[in-house]
Amino acid sequence: QAEESPFVGNPGNITGARGLTGTLRCQLQVQGEPPEVHWLRDGQILELADSTQTQVPLGEDEQDDWIVVSQLRITSLQLSDTGQYQCLVFLGHQTFVSQPGYVGLEGLPYFLEEPEDRTVAANTPFNLSCQAQGPPEPVDLLWLQDAVPLATAPGHGPQRSLHVPGLNKTSSFSCEAHNAKGVTTSRTATITVLPQQPRNLHLVSRQPTELEVAWTPGLSGIYPLTHCTLQAVLSDDGMGIQAGEPDPPEEPLTSQASVPPHQLRLGSLHPHTPYHIRVACTSSQGPSSWTHWLPVETPEGVPLGPPENISATRNGSQAFVHWQEPRAPLQGTLLGYRLAYQGQDTPEVLMDIGLRQEVTLELQGDGSVSNLTVCVAAYTAAGDGPWSLPVPLEAWRPGQAQPVHQLVKEPSTPAFSWPHHHHHHHHHH
């Protein structure tokens, strides 16, 4: 049969509120060298126990009896400290444990989760969380909005999660936790009501250097909108603005619009250029979220100036004309050049030269037409740019370089088709 337990004093019980400090104590009487006393909580050796051991000899000889007292200090009682405590000693080849003592927690409810401050769009549903525990259980929750209870009694209304169908003004929320020991009140969360995200951002009109955009404002609760902010950023295929990407990759062009009207003219833009735009509206409580980025594009314009450095020389029934691209902005993709020539008493002849910058003309009437002038204009998909001033055809003088003659051909079909002017085809043999 087992030897008699050396324990003469067993741990007591401790029950208290969180943060309490207490001590468990056990005492044993042993013969010979005193053993180390270990503490168990729910069968598990406490490795980092705050314990002290005191040993008092009862006689002169080491082999006499000793009284050993071990004290375990629990500082700032927590739920994790609760359980059954025992002392444990290894004596020779035997193991002894004391009778158990119990540590319990009992006090006002303790919050595991409290409502947090947040922003919400006006009239938009959201949830708040609150969680509390004892012991003692049960713990019943009571939600308050602007200090007004949302239920008749604790435990009757929503508990861990409060669903708010929407707010039209900034409000405060808190929760009370009730148990047999009393009431604890959570922090107060401020829920700030911001305007809803604007909707239906769209283009009203487009011009090569400006876009007019409009949108529908979202609800903003009791707070009128003070202004809306529009951002535009150049889109680049490699830029990576996705539908909901939060930040543009470069500094956007930002404009503020007084509201109403919910419309804004964005000027000083590049023609024939893709942009992404978004809008947010602000009330006294703060700004709404941005709309998704909307891809838009300024249209092409016509070239702003005529071709440059036009020269025209004549040699008998042939005329050689060449020019350079306009220096003025093209406002789009250059599709080609139109050339017009006219004699003093002859009708004007219009030609589409395509993208070449020189042409050899076969003149009718064996070169007898007098006072011939040539005009050239550049064109984009949006139309013709201004015509150059008429350039007179100069007679070719020996010593001048003979021009390289090229056939006047129909240009390759452009990406956009336009109503063609009457083309004259002159074949040079």
Epitope: A2, D42, G43, I45, E47, Q84, V97
Partner: antibody
Framework: QVQLVQSGAEVKKPGASVKVSCKAS????????INWVKQAPGQGLEWIGW????????KYNEKFKGRVTLTVDTSISTAYMELSRLRSDDTAVYYC?????????WGQGTLVTVSS | EIVLTQSPDFQSVTPKEKVTITCSAS?????MYWYQQKPDQSPKSLIY???NLASGVPSRFSGSGSGTDYTLTINSLEAEDAATYYC?????????FGQGTKLEIK
């Protein structure tokens, strides 16, 4: 001396329950925790849970919670483990073991075979 | 849960040799325990509180270590030491065991 003697081998069908006993002697039964440990064929050791005979308090490994029930009868110094809704992967040797912060004494083991 | 990894999984040794088995924990622990299990027998406590010999265990067995790394040493191996050895922790719940090291005598 401390001894833990377990009940004999069992063969059960899937979905059935099994109850294994562990009789303790040689020490004050109500002072020490009784643990149960599983060892599947050719496998290692897996802790199932403990019971404190003095109070009947129990603690279970999450993996076994809901299917295992630990009980004691202090009048005959015997601990029991009941495993319900048996599956083929419950086939194993089940050991009871006394604990003093570790498993200082073990029963001889009970083989439970689950087979249809 | 804390995972214990033993090394090696298997070792074949000759009598009188010194054997070292290591056990590595996935988190720091305070104490390690070691058990011996012979074929068709139940496990038997060998070392407790990292370095204390359990009742009846020969002095050729010893344990050491701290933190995450622990060692079981058998000085001058004997034929009767052929068994599987398991390390175990109970620093946090649930208590867990290593996968075992099988020791074979040549």
């Amino acid at each position: 001396q401390v001894q833990l003697v377990q009940s004999g081998a069992e063969v059960k069908k899937p979905g059935a329950s099994v109850k294994v006993s562990c009789k303790a002697s040689g020490y004050p039964f109500t002072d020490f925790y009784i643990n149960w440990v599983k060892q599947a064929p050719g496998q290692g050791l897996e802790w199932i849970g403990w019971i404190y005979p003095g109070s009947g308090n129990t603690k279970y490994n999450e993996k076994f919670k809901g299917r295992v029930t630990l009980t004691v009868d202090t009048s005959i110094s015997t601990a029991y483990m009941e495993l319900s809704r048996l599956r083929s992967d419950d086939t194993a040797v089940y050991y009871c073991a006394r604990s003093t912060g570790f498993f200082d004494y073990w029963g001889q083991g009970t083989l439970v075979t689950v087979s249809s | 849960e804390i995972v214990l990894t033993q090394s090696p999984d298997f070792q074949s040794v000759t009598p009188k040799e010194k054997v070292t088995i290591t056990c590595s924990a996935s988190s720091s622990i305070g104490y390690m325990y070691w058990y011996q299990q012979k074929p068709d027998q139940s496990p038997k406590s060998l070392i407790y509180l990292t370095s204390n010999l359990a009742s009846g265990v020969p002095s050729r067995f010893s344990g050491s270590g701290s933190g995450t790394d622990y060692t079981l040493t058998i000085n001058s191996l004997e034929a009767e030491d052929a068994a599987t050895y398991y390390c175990q922790q109970w620093s946090s719940n649930p208590p867990t065991f290593g996968q075992g090291t099988k020791l074979e005598i040549k």
